[in-house]
Structures are given as structure tokens and as C-alpha cells.
């Protein structure tokens, strides 16, 4: 007991009334108004509870505190008086805050702030919507993925911030009268090949595809090492150069130098260089055959192999290169007598005649082109007098029937067994390399040295043997007529040709030798 008569055991939040009683402080209550035992407690009164008599008024909230309460303006409202708290309705001066005016950037980008009582909302601009996790933030609507499919199928949808575009797909263009961008855009495929919008290398041919294009190697060309064919970046090289290399097993410096020149010409070859390249190859061949050097020291059989390889390769190279020439007639001649005549045309339905110093060739144009080949038609004739040196003593292999016929009408082969080459060796080629069975025959008229009387004159071609060498043969070639210094031959295939004089002794006037003009 306190000497002043005040209880010292009063519970928390209470004050003593006298020495034996306590009373709860304002804002607290206990079970009974007067507390007489220390076991009782004073609990905070929640003045803000529903049944409470406290009224803060509109636009305000009641906040309970320990032993008291405060009235404060609700979020979005503020007191006109400036007093942050108040106790009853009569002190309430709360009014709506215009957040939109207070903070113009409240809705960030792409939204418009709209004030509401106690708050605000964000109204998104067209093409935007409120973000669910942040209702105050406007985010772009991706019209392209929203399932609306706003664009025509010939276009592709391009989402923009707040909008979208219907753009022509790569390789497409707006149809005449159509815009390129709005949702009414309609497109069509661009033919990049005919419009010149392609990036194909000059070693390739452009092929249009739907919405794109591809570049394919020209006929006779192959993709460069490691580069696939039929791509936009395909680059090709002429196969003719890469395959025309010295024949295996032949050791000749002169020949090696010739092939070095061929490879040098092929290294930086481009279609536009075809004319110069053809001339340079024939110039090199002409020089090789004029001065064969160590080729002349090779055994005869090896010389024949070299000749076979040169004739075969030359035909391929000239065929490949001439496809890149522009239309027209070309004639080249070289100091040692090598001569080239070439005609390049778009397919025409007529016969073609190529005239040279020592030979004339006549055939139908329609033989020249392989069906489906888009390139120009080429007919070519090369006279290679110098090849005679390498083909000296080359064997003649007759078909059994011809062999028998000759034995019947002639006494037989004389002691000097090898036939004599009367004419220049000529090589004929077409853009079409399938010339083993021509639908209509080719006619050659050879000018040549005088025929020794009573000797058999034969129209022959060079047959490339399996062994890479070869021999003269007559299969598919017939001698139409001959006189002292000219012979007419007709053949059903193309290759390298010549007129031979075989050492047969003619017993009587041979009707085959009668000239047919």
C-alpha cells in the first residue's frame, strides 16, 4: 500500500483511484469499470469498430491506435485544412486528389490518365492493353500473334509498337494497285531472275522459285569445292579446265607446259572471257603441235595416247566454252594451220555449213541442241593439221564386214602396213555432247594431198580406246566420193575425222571411188 493512498499494483494502461482500486486509462476498458485485483487487464478500445460512435465522415478512414484513434483521408483524397489527422466528421475536410494533374506521367507511355473519385485509371491508346500484373501499365498488343490474322496470306504480319503492318514476304511484291503495309496489302511472287534482282554469280543460271530464287551451275560447270549447288551463293567452276590435265604416265615437258597454260587460263575463267580463252587455248595447241619438242621422242603408242587425250579434251573444252559466246559466226586461224570455225545460234531449223581452208562440214542445226538445254546451240569445227605428227603410224581397225569386202576387191594390205594420213585431222563438236548416233548424218568435204593411183581412200574417225589411246576406225562413216585431192565423207556420229589412204592395191576400177557430186 502506498502511503499516499494509491494502489501500486494497477495493471498496464490503468491509473489508481485509491489504495485498493484502479481504473483503465481513456481508450482502454476492463471487465468492470473499477479494477480491484491485479489479475484484471485494460484492453485497447477499437474506436473504429462498426458499432463505435466515432464517425470520421466521407472520403476518410478511421485508424485505431493504442488508446485512441485517428481519422485520415482515404487514399486518393487529401485534407483541404492541411491537417493530416482529425477526430470527427466536423473536422473532416477531405476532398478528391486529381492524380492525373499531379503526375502527368502516371500512366507511363501509351496510356491516358483518367481521374476517378479517390483514384485514377489508365486508358490505353489503340493497339495497347493494360498489363494484368500492372493495371496502370499499357503494353503493346501483338496483333500478329493474337489470333486475329489481320493480314492476307501472301503477306507476313509485322508487329509494330501500337500497330502492325502487312508486308510482302521476301521475294514478293504488291500486286498492281496494292499498297505495301496496310492490312489490305496483297502480294505476288517476284521473278528475281527476269527482273534482274537476283545475286547469282555469272557462273550460274538463275531459277525462280515461289518467293525466292536459286542459282544453279551452268551446263558444263560444277559447284566450287565446298559450295553446294542450287543456293543463292552458289559459285561454279568450269569442269572443262579441271578435267583436262596431262594423261597419266606421259612424261613430256612440252606437254606439261601446254597443260600449265590451260590451267592458268582456267584459274580465273569467267563466261565473258570465253572468246579470249578459246583463242588462247588454240594458240597454245597450235604452238605445241608446231614444236612438239620431247613429245616426238615418245614411243609411237604414247604419242597416239597424247593425241587421243588432246582431241578428246579439246572437244570438251571448246564445247563448254562456246556455250558462253554470243550469237554469231567465229573463225580463228593460227600460224601452224590450226583453224576453228564456230557458229552460235538460238535454236534454228536449218542446215549449217562451216567452211575452212581444208575442210567443209554440213549438218542440221537441230542436232546441235540437247532437248531441255536452255543454252544456245553451238556447232564447231577445228582443223588440226599438226595432230598428224602425233598420229603417224596410228593403226586402222576396220569392222569385219569392211575388212572382208576389201579383201575381196583388193589384193590385200601391202608390206608397208600403216595407212597414210592424207588430210588434216578435224574435230567436230556440238553443244549437245550426245553425238554418237545423229538423226541425220553429217557431211565432210576434205581437201587433201593427191591420192596415189589404185590406193584405197577411207573416211575415218579417231576412236578413243578403253586404254586412253585409240585408233582410226570407219564405223558409221562412209566415203561418198573421192577425186585426186578431195574426198566427201558422210558420218552418223561426231568425233575427230580424217581421210586415210590405205595401202591396198586396187585390182580394177572400184565403183566406190567414183566421185559423187
Amino acid at each position: 500500500q502506498d502511503s499516499r493512498g494509491c494502489a501500486r499494483w494497477c495493471p498496464q494502461d490503468s491509473s489508481c483511484v485509491n489504495a485498493t482500486a484502479c481504473r483503465c486509462n481513456p481508450g482502454f476498458s476492463s471487465f468492470s469499470e473499477i479494477i480491484t485485483t491485479p489479475m484484471e487487464t485494460c484492453d485497447d478500445i477499437n474506436e473504429c469498430a462498426t458499432l463505435s460512435k466515432v464517425s470520421c465522415g466521407k472520403f476518410s478512414d478511421c485508424w485505431n491506435t493504442e488508446g485512441s484513434y485517428d481519422c485520415v483521408c482515404s487514399p486518393g483524397y487529401e485534407p483541404v485544412s492541411g491537417a493530416k489527422t482529425f477526430k470527427n466528421e466536423s473536422e473532416n475536410t477531405c476532398q478528391d486528389v486529381d492524380e492525373c494533374q499531379q503526375n502527368p506521367r502516371l500512366c507511363k507511355s501509351y496510356g491516358t490518365c483518367v481521374n476517378t473519385l479517390g483514384s485514377y485509371t489508365c486508358q490505353c491508346l489503340p493497339g495497347f492493353k493494360l498489363k494484368p500484373e500492372d493495371p496502370k501499365l499499357c503494353t503493346d498488343v501483338n496483333e500478329c500473334t493474337s489470333g486475329q490474322n489481320p493480314c492476307h496470306s501472301s503477306t507476313h504480319c509485322l508487329n509494330n509498337v501500337g500497330s502492325y503492318q502487312c508486308r510482302c514476304r521476301p521475294g514478293w511484291q504488291p500486286i498492281p494497285g496494292s499498297p505495301n503495309g496496310p492490312n489490305n496489302t496483297v502480294c505476288e511472287d517476284v521473278d528475281e531472275c527476269s527482273s534482274g534482282q537476283h545475286q547469282c554469280d555469272s557462273s550460274t543460271v538463275c531459277f525462280n522459285t515461289v518467293g525466292s530464287y536459286s542459282c544453279r551451275c551452268r551446263p558444263g560447270w560444277k559447284p566450287r569445292h565446298g559450295i553446294p549447288n542450287n543456293q543463292k551463293d552458289t559459285v561454279c567452276e568450269d569442269m572443262t579446265f579441271s578435267t583436262w590435265t596431262p594423261p597419266p604416265g606421259v612424261h613430256s615437258q612440252t606437254l606439261s607446259r601446254f597443260f600449265d597454260k590451260v590451267q592458268d587460263l582456267g584459274r580465273d575463267y569467267k563466261p565473258g572471257l570465253a572468246n579470249n580463252t578459246i583463242q588462247s587455248i588454240l594458240q597454245a595447241l597450235d604452238e605445241l603441235l608446231e614444236a612438239p619438242g620431247d613429245l616426238e621422242t615418245l614411243p609411237r603408242l604414247q604419242q597416239h595416247c597424247v593425241a587421243s587425250h588432246l582431241l578428246d579434251g579439246l572437244e570438251d573444252v571448246l564445247r563448254g566454252l562456246s556455250k558462253n559466246l554470243s550469237n554469231g559466226l567465229l573463225n580463228f586461224s593460227y600460224p601452224a594451220g590450226t583453224e576453228l570455225s564456230l557458229e552460235v545460234q538460238k535454236q534454228v531449223d536449218r542446215s549449217v555449213t562451216l567452211r575452212q581452208n581444208q575442210a567443209v562440214m554440213q549438218l542440221d542445226w537441230n542436232q546441235a541442241q540437247k532437248s531441255g538445254d536452255p543454252g544456245p546451240s553451238v556447232v564447231g569445227l577445228v582443223s588440226i593439221p599438226g595432230m598428224g605428227k602425233l598420229l603417224a603410224e596410228a593403226p586402222l581397225v576396220l569392222e569385219p564386214e569392211k575388212q572382208m569386202l576389201l579383201h575381196e576387191t583388193h589384193q590385200g594390205l601391202l608390206q608397208d602396213g600403216s595407212p597414210i594420213l592424207l588430210s588434216d585431222v578435224i574435230s567436230a563438236f556440238l553443244s549437245n555432247n550426245d553425238t554418237q548416233n545423229l538423226s541425220s548424218p553429217v557431211t565432210f568435204t576434205f581437201s587433201h594431198r593427191s591420192v596415189i593411183p589404185r590406193q584405197k581412200v577411207l573416211c575415218v574417225f579417231w576412236e578413243h580406246g578403253q586404254n586412253g589411246c585409240g585408233h582410226w576406225a570407219t564405223t558409221g562413216c562412209s566415203t561418198i566420193g573421192t577425186r585426186d585431192t578431195s574426198t566427201i565423207c558422210r558420218c552418223t556420229h561426231l568425233s575427230s575425222f580424217a581421210v586415210l589412204m590405205a595401202h591396198y592395191d586396187v585390182q580394177e576400177e572400184d565403183p566406190v571411188l567414183t566421185v559423187i557430186t
Epitope: 592458268d264 569467267k270 579470249n276 588462247s280 594458240q283
Partner: antibody, heavy 118, light 106 residues
């Protein structure tokens, strides 16, 4: 007749770039590679590279790799040689020349003097 | 790369004399060309493909050789022939020139 007309002399600072042009006339532009050759004062001829006008394909020496760009404009029959990151040793007369493997460089431009000086 | 070495570096001769210029290659060359250059002018093609005379070149100039050794010959030097001569190979990239031979008046 064949003519190769080059652009005029240039003075450049180190680190800058220079673009020399060469306009061809009198022949089929795509039938020859166009070569670029330079000659430093009192020195010999040095091949830089070449461009094929038909498709823009180029060849160049390792020495100039990454620094030289050779282009062509077929509509004007003009080729261009741009040399970047210039240094004083790039001071030279730059020539364009029409060339083919077997025929050599048979026609030359008059030359363009490029002086690189700070 | 193919290195071309020209010799001699300088050739002192009188008009009317014969000049023989050599060009040696570090490896075999198929296409060798020769050029003449006078001070302040662009080079001029003299001989192409080892031995062929370029258009407008007088026939006192001739070329020969094969493989790695090539020669340019001027049969009788004229006053206008005193100049620098370069050989150039076109057999492998990079194309290369010789360092030049100066033909001067003795």
C-alpha cells in the same frame, strides 16, 4: 579505241581512305579482268588485285587483304579501288589496267597519284 | 608467290647496240609478259605470252624462254628505247612483276 580514264590526284591524311575510279571505253567491259597496280616513288610495279566487271568477283594479294575494296559499276563501265587505313608508305601512283592471262595488261590508265601525308 | 628476278638491274648501252634482259622465276611460269615504262608515264605492254609482239610494237623487240628463264631482246637500240623494262608472270596469284631493268644511254 580502248581507253581507261582514271580520277584525279588525291591528298589524304594517315588513317583515311581513298577511292580511285577507272572508266573504261572502247571494248566489252566484261571481257577482261581489270587489274590494279601501284608504283611508289622511284620503285617498281606492284600488283594489288583485280575485279571482274561481269560479276564483281575480286582477287587481291594478302598484303592488302582487309584494306582494299574493288568494285564496279557496269552501267557506267567504271571500276573503283578503295584503299583504307592509309599510311605514308601508300603514297604511290595507282594504275588500272585491262588484263587477260594470255595477253597481259594491254591497256593502262594514266595513273592516279595518291599522297598520304599528315 | 612466284618471285621474278631481273638482271642486270641497269644496262648501259649505246644506240644501235643489242640489249638482252633476263628474267628468272622462282618456279615455272606459263605466261610471261614484258612491259616498258618511261618516266612519268604508265607502263606499256611490249611482249605477251613469252614471245608475241604486242600491237604497235616494233619488231626489234623479241621475247623468248620457257619454264623459269625468260629473255627480252632489243636487236638495235633506238633512242626511244631507253627506259625501264619489267617482266610479269600470270601463272599464279598473286601476279608478280620483276624489280625492273633500267636501260640507260652509255
Amino acid at each position: 579505241q580502248v581507253q581507261l580514264q582514271q580520277s584525279g590526284a588525291e591528298v589524304k591524311k594517315p588513317g583515311a581512305s581513298v577511292k580511285v575510279s577507272c572508266k573504261a571505253s572502247g571494248y566489252t567491259f566484261t571481257n577482261y579482268w581489270m587489274q590494279w597496280v601501284r608504283q611508289a616513288p622511284g620503285q617498281g610495279l606492284e600488283w594489288m588485285g583485280a575485279v571482274y566487271p561481269g560479276d564483281g568477283d575480286t582477287r587481291h594479294t594478302q598484303k592488302f587483304k582487309g584494306r582494299v575494296t574493288m568494285t564496279r559499276d557496269t552501267s557506267t563501265s567504271t571500276v573503283y579501288m578503295e584503299l583504307s587505313s592509309l599510311r605514308s608508305e601508300d603514297t604511290a601512283v595507282y594504275y588500272c589496267a585491262r588484263g587477260f592471262t594470255a595477253y597481259g595488261m594491254d591497256y593502262w590508265g594514266q595513273g592516279t597519284l595518291v599522297t598520304v601525308s599528315s | 608467290e612466284i618471285v621474278l628476278t631481273q638482271s642486270p638491274a641497269t644496262l648501259s648501252l649505246s644506240p644501235g647496240e643489242r640489249a638482252t634482259l633476263s628474267c628468272s622465276a622462282s618456279s615455272s611460269v606459263s605466261y610471261m609478259h614484258w612491259y616498258q615504262q618511261k618516266p612519268g608515264l604508265a607502263p606499256r605492254l611490249l611482249i605477251y605470252d613469252t614471245s608475241k609482239l604486242a600491237s604497235g610494237i616494233p619488231d626489234r623487240f623479241s621475247g623468248s624462254g620457257s619454264g623459269t628463264d625468260f629473255t627480252l631482246t632489243i636487236s638495235r637500240l633506238e633512242p626511244e628505247d631507253f627506259a625501264v623494262y619489267y617482266c610479269q608472270q600470270w601463272s599464279s596469284n598473286p601476279l608478280t612483276f620483276g624489280q625492273g631493268t633500267k636501260v640507260e644511254i652509255k
